[in-house]
């Protein structure tokens, strides 16, 4: 047999035995001569070349470039390939010699009493147990233990080859501690040496680089990259790194196994790449590859090397952020820089601290934005090394969808006396201001629930055929006033008013306000009644702890069964776009009240008295009367507001003043409180008494001293008192000049 490529000028060495395979008996002599065209050498089994005592290689006597290999008394272990080759070339001729030794059919390893077989538990992998034969056509089986198991060649995946050994799928013997080959010759069993089975893993679960991404350094800094490979047990790992500047002076690689918890089904290997002082040429892709022989996994990361520390804002940094009330606002600080900057946020110059409503970090997050969040936000980036600072201003504009103030203040249902002129109002707050406020209407009887119908709070009216107020055919004559703008509670609001010339028909009116971020609406139930009439005694808003009475007067010839109710809280809130349920058609929400009935010649009067009114008494009071003939119920609603008691306060200060004799002094003392306080004046702690020169007006609010005299000089005190206490302010009046002598002297 020939090995290697034939050279143009060189023939292959020629062997004296022109066969690929030679079979000889043990104890005979093996002799092969090799002839060639230049210096030759022999290789033989086991020792392969060199100093084996029994093997003799001699120069031929009959020519140059000729060598004879002689082995006297050959044994089974001499079985193998005998190779004659030209020195320092691949050109060779090979003959495979079987030395048939029936007492030792397997070729034993020179040094070992046992061998080692490495296997992986891979279904698709086979393993070769190198029990070579000195006889080519033996019947060989493989024994594995423990437990004892025998494997016989099946002509498929299990086979024996005298030159190679026993081939078997590795998983079949992975359980075993040892294996050996066995041959049967003439009912006699012959065993190869024992092979210890060592199961080796190969699976790499993952390869992780740390830091994994966004690695930035500046020139001169140290780069440390950790590459961790997680594998199954019994795996050996080889790490290989690829990086931009391979010829690095200060590069250091350390590989080590990491300890894992006992009982862990996993092994960890770590390779650390360190570059002490990076340069710009170290910028680039760093790849770590971990190999177990059967498997390779790799991971990469990009390392950026900056010339020096720096900080700058990114091009995507916003300058204007618009949001709607209630939204979550995120303003990211977009920057370029190394190392990452310290980030500080300010609002209108005041530092922002994180709390449950706001998070001030790389991203400024306002959980639920409100109007008060409107303003200029400054973000300042500071480079931690160079201390370089960059600032940027972001304006946050918070939009408010239209909110209609009366919704929360005014009763959902009100009754209006027939024939009267009425004004309906919608006060709208919105940012930006509403671009329109439109009024609509519909007849009450078209849309009110019949008593037989079940009232659904979520949809109290079966129809919603809204008509524009310009079309008041069949309704009340209407006029919409031009929108007005008012500063209410410190907010710019738009006020739209609808004037009903004469309340003739019961209807529903709706005002709808729209701006760029939303819409708001308010539905007003305009119930016109010829029926009962409510009056409040005393005819004003009571203060808590005062008494108040509601009088319901109805024509006795038309109405009967007068009853007072209080409108209870709505079972569910009225949502935007929903309509208030007509009170008379839904008595479930009413609480019946005790009241006293009086009569005169024409009317019945039902009086409901609240002694010591409290804030809880506020609400909507309903007087219900039944038509004597039709039995139809008529309702009138009156909203009662109870004012909170407030201790007296005096607004504004009394100023000390200097006045010349004969001039006038005018001062005012404005007091507020509930109940309204009484104002009294004192001079030098004595009650000031009115006379021709001292005038008190407007409930003692204004004090005038005409033609002042020297004796008017002194400490003046204004005191405002109610049952809740007193408030006072003081001023000293200095009178200059000499007193003129009177004519009486």
């Amino acid at each position: 047999a020939s090995v290697g490529l034939p050279s143009v000028s060189l023939d292959l060495p020629r062997l004296s035995i022109q066969k690929d395979i030679l079979t000889i008996k043990a104890n005979t002599t093996l002799q092969i001569t090799c002839r060639g065209q230049r210096d030759l050498d022999w290789l033989w089994p086991n020792n392969q070349s060199g100093s084996e005592q029994r093997v003799e290689v001699t120069e031929c006597s009959d020519g140059l470039f000729c060598k004879t290999l002689t082995i006297p008394k050959v044994i089974g272990n001499d079985t193998g390939a005998y190779k004659c080759f030209y020195r320092e070339t691949d050109l060779a001729s090979v003959i495979y010699v079987y030395v048939q030794d029936y007492r030792s059919p397997f070729i034993a390893s020179v040094s070992d009493q046992h061998g080692v077989v490495y296997i992986t538990e891979n279904k698709n992998k086979t393993v070769v147990i190198p029990c070579l034969g000195s006889i080519s056509n033996l019947n060989v089986s493989l024994c594995a233990r423990y437990p004892e198991k025998r494997f016989v060649p099946d002509g498929n995946r299990i086979s024996w080859d005298s030159k190679k050994g026993f081939t078997i799928p590795s998983y079949m013997i992975s359980y075993a501690g040892m294996v050996f080959c066995e041959a049967k010759i003439n009912d006699e069993s012959y065993q190869s040496i024992m092979y210890i089975v060592v199961v080796v893993g190969y699976r790499i679960y993952d390869v992780v680089l740390s830091p994994s991404h966004g690695i930035e350094l500046s020139v001169g800094e140290k780069l440390v990259l950790n590459c961790t490979a997680r594998t199954e047990l019994n795996v050996g790992i080889d790490f290989n790194w690829e990086y931009p500047s391979s010829k690095h002076q200060h590069k250091k690689l350390v590989n080590r196994d990491l300890k894992t918890q006992s009982g862990s089904e996993m092994k960890k290997f770590l390779s650390t790449l360190t570059i002490d002082g990076v340069t710009r040429s170290d910028q680039g892709l760093y790849t770590c590859a971990a190999s177990s022989g059967l498997m390779t996994k790799k991971n990469s990361t990009f390392v950026r090397v900056h010339e020096k520390p720096f900080v700058a804002f990114g091009s995507g940094m916003e300058s204007l952020v618009e949001a709607t009330v209630g939204e979550r606002v995120r303003i990211p600080a977009k920057y370029l820089g190394y190392p990452p900057p310290e980030i500080k946020w300010y609002k209108n110059g005041i530092p922002l601290e994180s709390n449950h409503t706001i998070k001030a970090g790389h991203v400024l997050t306002i959980m639920e934005v409100s109007e008060r969040d409107t303003g200029n936000y400054t973000v300042i980036l500071t480079n931690p090394i160079s201390k370089e600072k960059q600032s940027h201003v972001v304006s946050l504009v918070v939009y408010v969808p239209p909110q209609i103030g009366e919704k929360s203040l005014i009763s959902p249902v009100d009754s209006y006396q027939y024939g009267t002129t009425q004004t309906l109002t919608c006060t709208v707050y919105a940012i930006p201001p509403p671009h329109h406020i439109h009024w609509y209407w519909q007849l009450e009887e078209e849309c009110a629930n019949e008593p037989s119908q079940a009232v659904s709070v979520t949809n109290p009216y079966p129809c919603e055929e809204w008509r524009s107020v310009e079309d008041f055919q069949g309704g009340n004559k209407i006029e919409v006033n031009k929108n007005q703008f008012a500063l209410i509670e410190g907010k710019n609001k738009t006020v739209s008013t609808l004037v009903i010339q004469a309340a003739n028909v019961s209807a529903l009116y709706k005002c709808e306000a729209v701006n760029k971020v939303g819409r708001g609406e308010r539905v007003i139930s305009f119930h016109v009644t010829r029926g009962p009439e409510i009056t409040l005694q005393p005819d004003m808003q009571p203060t808590e702890q005062e008494s108040v009475s509601l009088w319901c007067t109805a024509d006795r010839s038309t109405f009967e069964n007068l009853t007072w109710y209080k409108l209870g809280p709505q079972p569910l809130p009225i949502h935007v776009g929903e309509l208030p349920t007509p009170v008379c058609k839904n008595l479930d929400t009413l609480w019946k009240l005790n009241a006293t009935m009086f009569s005169n010649s024409t009317n019945d009067i039902l009086i409901m008295e609240l002694k010591n009114a409290s804030l809880q008494d506020q609400g909507d009071y309903v007087c219900l009367a039944q038509d004597r003939k039709t039995k139809k119920r008529h309702c009138v609603v009156r909203q009662l507001t109870v004012l909170e008691r407030v201790a007296p306060t005096i607004t504004g200060n009394l100023e000390n003043q200097t006045t010349s004799i004969g001039e006038s002094i005018e001062v005012s003392c404005t007091a507020s409180g509930n109940p309204p306080p009484q104002i009294m004046w004192f001079k030098d702690n004595e009650t000031l008494v009115e006379d021709s020169g001292i005038v008190l007006k407007d409930g003692n609010r204004n004090l005038t001293i005409r033609r002042v005299r020297k004796e008017d000089e002194g400490l003046y005190t204004c005191q405002a008192c109610s049952v809740l206490g007193c408030a006072k302010v003081e001023a000293f009046f200095i009178i200059e000049g000499a007193q003129e002598k009177t004519n009486l002297e």
């Epitope: 005694q537 005393p538 009475s549 006293t596 005169n600 010649s601 008295e609």
Partner: nanobody, 124 residues
Framework: QVQLQESGGGSVQAGGSLRLSCVAS????????MGWFRQAPGKEREGVAG????????YYANSVKGRFTISQDNAKNTVYLQMNTLKPEDTAIYYC?????????????????WGQGTQVTVSS
């Protein structure tokens, strides 16, 4: 100083009559509304009858309607309560009350001035 002085109370058999008078001093009966209240033992004071300024309209509680009549004599600055067909449940102290011109003093919260009261006892 406003003073209201009641008289005419006393004891009477059920079905009998009594006439209560209330003389006002320091207060014009014709320019203000007037009324009568009563308080039975263990009960709250309640409005019985009222008359508006000028005497053009009179008001009665349901319990006395048709039996009691309120009137006034502007010249004497006096208000009267004529009580007919008296019942044992009419037993009470009767008070004269003066209010503003409007509304008539049918409930306590609109009363400005009170009389001392006169006892009426009706036995069955």
């Amino acid at each position: 100083q406003v003073q209201l002085q009641e008289s005419g109370g006393g004891s009477v058999q059920a079905g009998g009559s009594l006439r209560l008078s209330c003389v006002a001093s320091g207060y014009s009966v014709s320019k203000n509304s007037m009324g009568w209240f009563r308080q039975a033992p263990g009960k709250e004071r309640e409005g019985v009858a009222g008359i508006n300024e000028g005497g053009t309209a009179t008001y009665y509680a349901n319990s006395v309607k048709g039996r009691f009549t309120i009137s006034q004599d502007n010249a004497k600055n006096t208000v009267y309560l004529q009580m007919n067909t008296l019942k044992p449940e009419d037993t009470a102290i009767y008070y004269c009350a003066a209010g503003s011109p409007d509304p008539p003093p049918l409930i306590e919260s609109v009363v400005k001035y009170w009389g001392q009261g006169t006892q009426v006892t009706v036995s069955s």
